[in-house]
């Protein structure tokens, strides 16, 4: 707002006002008179650049006279009054409102007095952010998408990852005129590393008093990784059962577990329980390699692990007794 | 075209009052300021007020106040100043003038041709 | 109240450039004081030519200028005319009132 003038009568207003499409918005206008100073207001206007004629008139004996009577309004102004207050309210608030307007003041004996206000017409865009599943094809792709529907002006997306990966952010019109919608992806190469991690992702615009963040679980099909642990290269004939495990990572989850050997099927020591391969005691020294073959939707992987059953019993409890 | 048309000369006792009119026409009379001046014989220009014919707000100058009451009559389009507790030194030519407008800028427009106030016992 | 001060009287030749001058008591002459400049000829009524410091009139004569001097209000006449022979006033405004200053005779001579 401007200052207060000194000995000058002055027209306040603010330089810009913001309001929203469809909705109503008041540009302020008022005449600050300095207190010594006498004057009188016979007529305020309303005026929009680069268009000829008046949009609203409030006249000291006349009253007001509107170019849109449906959609314009003296705040303030009535007849039999001072008029020192040419606050106007537009209603339906169109995107070919936005631009500048003049609020004029006819004063006597110190003539016109007027003030520009920029009208900036808005649209509170909505805002939603999903994943984009994917599989390993070992080349960039969205993972995510981020869209802000409908904003006016549009909409600033920035994503926040950790994973890499780049931004692809594109604008077409919105549903209603005048309005754009603006869809960012986040793209990178998929990895069963970036599967279940998170991005997210930023939207600013100066209808929110703060950034919308909307964070966004990615998820990566990719077909079972597989390894055998339970072996630590200590296992001794005589000693107690053990166990193996078949870990798998995958999505979707695993859906068989399967266990062989490079020989072919299980041996009689060998007892598959899912996930799991219980070995129980042997009785002479053995050298088997296992396989664990797991499935999922996206296809098969298998582990091997070769075990060894030594000789000679271990100086402390370990290897087979361990499990 | 537009013109000011003021009434003849009156010759008054001092403590007594005088209206003096002010007829308007070539313009809309409802939406002009008229101000009110006087010239005392041998004496400068004085500004008394001013009234807005539409609304009859007024604004004295301030050595008047009390003294001088201005109307207007939209229907004939006339201004009025009364002028009470006449003395001597009212003596004057008064004139009415309609202030026009440049767009920026308000002007001494149109004069009345003046009315003569004599005060004398 | 304030005391507006014009030139009593100017002598300008036809065709000649006069610069008729307004001093206020109070100080420097500036916009807020809105100067209006009247003409009176003899025997005939007043006329605004000037009004809000620099705006002329409709149908006043472009030769006829109004601005500020300096610390006074000033009419400026240039490429003088015989008929241009009259009284000058000038007007000022103080916040809730108008004073009118002596006049200037401006003689073309």
């Known amino acids: 707002w401007p200052p207060p003038g000194t000995g000058d009568i002055i027209v306040q207003a603010p330089t810009q006002v913001p309001g929203f499409l469809g909705d109503s918005v008041t540009l302020p206008c008022y005449l600050q008179v300095p207190g010594m100073e006498e004057t009188h207001v016979s007529q305020l206007t309303w005026s929009r650049h680069g268009e000829s004629g008046s949009m609203a008139v409030f006249h000291q004996t006349q009253g007001p006279n509107y170019s849109e009577p449906k959609r314009l309004e003296f705040v303030a102004a009535r007849l039999g009054t001072e008029l020192r207050d040419a606050s106007l309210r537009m209603f339906g608030l169109r995107v070919e409102d936005e631009g500048n307007y003049t609020c004029l003041f006819v004063t006597f004996p110190q003539g016109s007095r007027s003030v520009d206000i920029w009208l900036r017409v808005l649209a509170k865009p909505q805002n939603t952010a999903e994943v984009q599943k994917v599989q390993l094809t070992g080349k960039p792709v969205p993972v995510a998408r981020c869209v802000s529907t409908g904003g006016r002006p549009p909409a600033h997306i920035t994503w926040h990852s950790d994973l890499g990966g780049m931004p692809n952010t594109s604008q077409a019109p919105g549903f209603l005129s005048g309005t754009v919608t603006v869809t960012s992806l986040w793209i990178l190469v998929p990895s069963s590393q970036v599967d279940g991690k998170s991005v997210t992702c930023k939207v600013e615009h100066e209808s929110f008093e703060k950034p919308q963040l909307l964070t966004v679980n990615l998820t990566v099909y990719y077909p079972p990784e597989v390894s055998i642990s339970g072996y630590d290269n200590n296992w001794y004939l005589s000693q107690n059962e053990a166990t193996l495990t078949c870990d798998a990572r995958s999505n979707p989850e695993p859906t068989g577990y399967n266990w062989s050997t490079t020989m072919g099927p299980l041996p009689p020591f060998a007892v598959a329980q899912g996930a799991q391969l219980l070995i129980r005691p042997v009785d002479k020294p053995i050298n088997t390699t296992f396989i664990c073959n797991v499935t999922n939707a996206l296809g098969a992987r298998q582990a091997e692990l070769t075990v060894q059953v030594k000789e000679g019993p271990p100086s402390e409890p370990s290897g087979m007794s361990s499990n | 075209q537009v013109q000011l048309v003021q009434s003849g000369a009156e010759v008054k006792k001092p403590g007594a009052s005088v209206k003096v009119s002010c007829k308007a026409s070539?313009?809309?009379?409802?939406?002009?300021?008229i101000s009110w001046v006087r010239q005392a014989p041998g004496q400068g220009l004085e500004w008394i007020a001013w009234i807005y014919a539409g609304t009859g707000d007024t604004n004295y100058n301030q050595k008047f106040t009390g003294r001088v009451t201005m109307t207007t009559d939209t229907s004939t389009s006339t201004a009025y100043m009364e002028l009470r507790s006449l003395r001597s030194d009212d003596t004057a030519v008064y004139y009415c003038?309609?202030?026009?407008?440049?767009?920026?800028?308000?002007?001494?427009?149109?004069w009345g041709q003046g009315t003569t106030v004599t005060v004398s016992s | 109240q304030a005391v507006v001060t014009q030139e009593p009287s100017l002598t300008v030749s036809p065709g000649g450039t006069v610069t008729l001058t307004c001093r206020s008591s109070t100080g420097a002459v500036t916009t807020s004081n809105y100067a209006n400049w009247v003409q009176q000829k003899p025997g005939q009524a007043f006329r605004g030519l000037i009004g809000g410091t620099n705006n002329r009139a409709p149908g006043v004569p472009a030769r006829f200028s109004g601005s500020l001097l300096g610390d006074k209000a000033a009419l400026t006449l240039s490429g003088a005319q015989p008929e241009d022979e009259a009284e000058y006033y000038c007007?000022?405004?103080?916040?809730?009132?108008?004073?009118f200053g002596g006049g200037t005779k401006l003689t073309v001579l």
């Open positions: 007007i000022l405004w103080y916040s809730n009132h108008f004073v």
């Open positions: 003038a309609r202030h026009g407008y440049t767009g920026r800028g308000w002007y001494f427009a149109v």
């Open positions: 070539g313009y809309t009379f409802t939406s002009s300021y």
